[in-house]
């Protein structure tokens, strides 16, 4: 015959554990149902009740089933150099990430101090690392046979152009200038191949930041009193 | 050749406004951003806004408390900063500035390598 | 971010060495500038990101430190040094009231 299903609160066997969604109160020495995102516990449970969830209020967050007697407070608002990629809702934190064109030059424990201006690769020099949430760009000048034209922090070294007849050879910050009216573009060492065409203006595409949290906030829940024996109390 | 020159300055009343002027020429405009920075006489230098001009976003020092705006026409390579209720406190030399272009290839706008001359305002009651 | 400079004025004979010292009031690693400024002109770029050297400024200029404290030391002094100089951090943002130091004067004898 199958087991019995037990419901919270009730005692767990010898050395067993507590399932899923559930933890161990020392007091009531019971496995008691945890609250879900977005509430917290409000009345713990005893021997003959379950515990008793509440919403949480405004401006604060649960993110885990949880026993957490109060919600955590959200972080405060994003700075003016940062933008708000997430809400503070009742089961999440706000997340604040740096504007773009800026990255996040002096992180925290979480989220982001200081953000900084990325800085940009001039005419003659192409992007060799593009910036990250947390890293400047890295510059490279641009190889024999390629170009870049702009100052931009996303433009790579791109191949010059090859001329049946050329007018004007091209460089580092130039493309070749033809007479023809076809001209291919060559695969030069260390050139980028792009399947259509580039415009010469830069594209001022960011870099996807990974979200870093908004400050003052923790996702630890406190410790609380250890089950008989070990075992998975998360979700 | 790099250049930025400001224009704009001169005598103004106290409470008037003034709108000071950057013109830009030399450089790729649309990529560089421009801050504008004072100078009272005999006084320290104090950063007074910034305009990034491929996202069109702004900046302004906490004590400016919005007498300031900063502006850009990017047809005319220039960059403006609108002052008013001007008091004396405001009278001082006000330079543009930008990034500086590094001979390793960077453009790092966090530092100011390219400054304009200056223009002097005066506010006089 | 508050950058704070000492000494406010610091005299040298020629051929000496000068020490300026800039402190921030949070770390700021090594996202800062030095300036100098001769009166009647703009302010002139001489150190970058703490000690890389800006074009064209002779090797003797010498920038050091990172979080919180900084020295600007100039070896050699020539009468040309003669100038007031300025730290910079790199984070001019709206939160920012204190972007540049005070200044410190720089008399050569």
């Known amino acids: 015959l199958p087991a019995q299903v037990a419901f919270t609160p009730y005692a767990p066997e010898p050395g067993g554990t507590c399932r899923l969604r559930e933890y161990y109160d020392q007091t009531a020495q019971m496995c008691c149902s945890k609250c879900p995102p977005g509430q917290h516990a409000k009345v713990f449970c005893t021997k003959t009740s379950d515990t008793v969830c509440d919403s949480c209020e405004d401006s604060t967050y649960t993110q885990l089933w949880n026993w957490v007697p109060e919600c955590l407070s959200c972080g405060s608002r994003c700075s003016s150099d940062q933008v708000e990629t997430q809400a503070c809702t009742r089961e999440q934190n706000r997340i604040c990430t740096c504007r773009p064109g800026w990255y996040c030059a002096l992180s925290k424990q979480e989220g982001c101090r200081l953000c900084a201006q990325l800085r940009k690769c001039r005419p003659g020099f192409g992007v060799a690392r593009p910036g990250t949430e947390t890293s400047d760009v890295v510059c490279k000048p641009c190889a024999p046979g390629t170009f870049s034209n702009t100052t931009s922090s996303t433009d790579i070294c791109r191949p010059h152009q090859i001329c049946h007849v050329v007018a004007i050879p091209g460089n580092a910050s130039m493309d070749a200038v033809c007479t023809s009216t076809s001209p291919t573009r060559s695969m030069a060492p260390g050139a980028v191949h792009l399947p259509q065409p580039v415009s010469t203006r830069s594209q001022h595409t960011q870099p996807t930041p990974a979200p870093s949290t908004a400050p003052g906030t923790s996702f630890l829940l406190p410790v609380g009193p250890s089950p008989p024996a070990e075992g998975s109390t998360g979700d | 050749q790099e250049q930025l020159v400001e224009s704009g300055g001169g005598l103004v009343t106290l409470g008037g406004s003034l709108k000071l002027s950057c013109k830009a020429s030399?450089?790729?405009?649309?990529?560089?951003?421009i801050s504008w920075v004072r100078q009272a006489p005999g006084k320290g230098l104090e950063w007074i806004a910034y305009?990034?001009?491929?996202?069109?976003?702004?900046d302004y020092a906490t004590w400016v408390n919005g007498r300031f705006t900063i502006s850009l026409d990017n047809a005319q390579n220039t960059v403006f900063l609108q002052m008013t209720s001007l008091t004396a406190a405001d009278t001082a030399t006000y330079f543009c500035?930008?990034?500086?272009?590094?001979?390793?290839?960077?453009?790092?706008?966090?530092?100011?390598?390219?400054w304009g001359p200056g223009t002097l305002v005066t506010v006089s009651s | 971010i508050k950058m704070t400079q000492t000494p406010a004025s610091v005299s040298a004979a020629v051929g000496g060495t000068v020490t300026i010292n800039c402190r921030a009031s949070e770390d700021i690693e090594s996202y800062l500038a030095w300036y100098q400024q001769k009166p009647g002109q703009p302010p002139k770029l001489l150190i970058y990101d703490a000690s890389d050297l800006a074009s064209g400024v002779p090797s003797r200029v010498k920038g050091s430190g990172s979080g919180t404290e900084f020295t600007l030391t100039i070896s050699g002094v020539r009468c040309d040094d003669a100038a007031t100089y300025y730290c910079?951090?790199?984070?001019?943002?709206?939160?920012?009231?204190?972007?540049f130091g005070g200044g410190t004067e720089v008399v050569v004898k």
């Open positions: 910079q951090h790199g984070f001019y943002t709206s939160r920012s009231d204190s972007v």
């Open positions: 500035a930008s990034g500086y272009a590094s001979s390793s290839g960077y453009y790092d706008p966090k530092y100011f390598g390219l």
């Open positions: 305009i990034y001009p491929d996202y069109g976003s702004t």
């Open positions: 030399g450089i790729d405009f649309s990529s560089y951003g």
